[in-house]
Amino acid sequence: EEELQVIQPEKSVSVAAGESATLNCTATSLIPVGPIQWFRGVGPGRELIYHQKEGHFPRVTPVSDPTKRNNMDFSIRISNITPADAGTYYCVKFRKGSPDVELKSGAGTELSVRAKPSAPVVSGPAVRATAEHTVSFTCESHGFSPRDITLKWFKNGNELSDFQTNVDPAGKSVSYSIRSTARVVLTRRDVHSQVICEVAHVTLQGDPLRGTANLSEAIRVPPFLEFTQQSMRADNQVNVTCQVMKFYPQRLQLTWLENGNVSRTEMASALPENKDGTYNWTSWLLVNVSAHRDDVKLTCQVEHDGQPAVNKSFSVKVSAHPKEQGSNTAAENTGTNERGSSDYKDDDDKHHHHHH
């Protein structure tokens, strides 16, 4: 009689996670009588997957009824495949005995499991940064197989090039993870900007997965401060306003000081949003000129998003002469500010770090 051969026709089989895998095996002879066993791997550490003669294997079913007369088809079907099932499976013929004796093995079938990557999760910096600074965003996705994967970064639809990507582990594994870090330069216009991490994989049928992060979580746009003053009113009061412009986020506290003494403190709330996502806020102070003998130094002190305070000072010169109602002469403002205006004196405090 011909010598028994164990034939595993497929060198490899690829299956999507959650599906069933069919591993084919046939013997060329009924002789010798004895069971088939399926193993994953080789050597003493091999894992028994199915034993025709004994044991309980709830996920494994023989393709052909083992009680079928003259059965030489020992193919099996493994249900609900997971990445952990990946490996090389061997169909091994045993000769009946006490115990059964291993006789011949098939060449093996490598089972690879196609597993979808998890939805990419994009995380930004722990602390906010200001415009012109570079911040890092990290994108992570896990559990995919095979290892080949493509990751791209976009900012407002424009592809980024400054990023570094790692796929782990480097060697063979049942599934893999990807981690990519992109460096993004912030601008003052980035409050409404978005970064997108896009992952493409064979399991996704050309429909990549995306993870997003809003730059609004990462950016701080410090305010510009401006003073304006209305003409003296009939009741010897001057209305001075401090305009806090183009800031983000909204968390802001403004304090008025008259000659170094706190006059009023206000918190910004429920402000309308500018088109670019920033906020403006105007605070005013009525200064009673007749109550002062000397010049009045007004300071608008702004504490934005927990940063060191920014001060802007404004000197109101009190005139010794009686004034004509409605004239400009009761409050005389001397000097120039950095913008070259001659309406008032504008002294930038040494703590005022923002640029105009």
Epitope: L30, H56, D65, R69
Partner: antibody, heavy 119, light 110 residues
Framework: QVQLVQSGAEVKKPGASVKVSCKAS????????INWVRQAPGQGLEWIAM????????HYNQIFKDRATLTTDTSTSTAYMELRSLRSDDTAVYYC????????????WGRGTLVTVSS | DIVLTQSPDSLAVSLGERATINCRAS??????????IFWYQQKPGQPPKLLIY???NLDPGVPDRFSGSGSGTDFTLTISSLQAEDVAVYYC????????FGQGTKLEIK
């Protein structure tokens, strides 16, 4: 290792029925056929029938088709052979045997159950 | 049905001598290159024991003084050198269709 343990001896009157059991161990019960064979005193072997425990498919010797019924209980890995309308010439040792190679052969045998039919 | 006829019905052979038992089928028991004949040994008070399967293949644990041969309708069980423990009744069985047994051959020591 494979073991087939049969129920004890029975004495029955003509016309009665007998049900012999065969409890299997040491292998996956549903993966192999069980055969039933009998042997009258001083006589040869006579094949009665076979059953596939996985789906209860049966094949009977025409001589026994009307009187014998094979069943299995997969929860206890036990096979049963019931013989009805007993006659004195049904007195025999009844064996269960497992077909290990799906060749319709009998690789492993129980020790037998003696059924005596006598008035 | 296929009928199996064994010959002789009984046989006496000296220890160490060759014993030969024949089994003839009423029609061929061959299919797909296999001969569906099996040989059993039954000692007094014991169940039968499988010796040979598919005409010529020794079941594991069976001494190699036993051998089987033949094809189609004519088959032979041979014990090359009879031992005392070989005293038994020997049966052939076919499974080309539903199984049947030969009537048995009683082997004794001369």
């Amino acid at each position: 290792q494979v073991q087939l343990v049969q129920s004890g001896a029975e004495v029955k009157k003509p016309g009665a029925s007998v049900k012999v059991s065969c409890k299997a161990s040491g292998y996956t019960f549903t993966n192999y056929w069980i055969n039933w064979v009998r042997q009258a005193p001083g006589q040869g072997l006579e094949w009665i029938a076979m059953i596939d425990p996985s789906d209860s498919e049966t094949h009977y010797n025409q001589i026994f088709k009307d009187r014998a019924t094979l069943t299995t209980d997969t929860s206890t890995s036990t096979a049963y052979m019931e013989l009805r309308s007993l006659r004195s010439d049904d007195t025999a040792v009844y064996y269960c045997a497992m077909d290990y190679g799906s060749l319709y052969a009998m690789d492993y045998w129980g020790r037998g159950t003696l059924v005596t039919v006598s008035s | 049905d296929i009928v199996l006829t064994q010959s002789p019905d009984s046989l006496a052979v000296s220890l160490g001598e060759r014993a030969t038992i024949n089994c003839r089928a009423s029609k061929s028991v061959s299919s797909s290159g296999y001969n569906y004949i099996f040989w059993y040994q039954q000692k007094p008070g014991q169940p039968p024991k499988l010796l040979i399967y598919l005409a010529s293949n020794l079941d594991p644990g069976v001494p190699d003084r036993f051998s089987g041969s033949g094809s189609g309708t004519d088959f032979t069980l041979t014990i090359s050198s009879l031992q005392a423990e070989d005293v038994a009744v020997y049966y052939c069985q076919h499974s080309r269709e539903l199984p049947t047994f030969g009537q048995g051959t009683k082997l004794e020591i001369k």
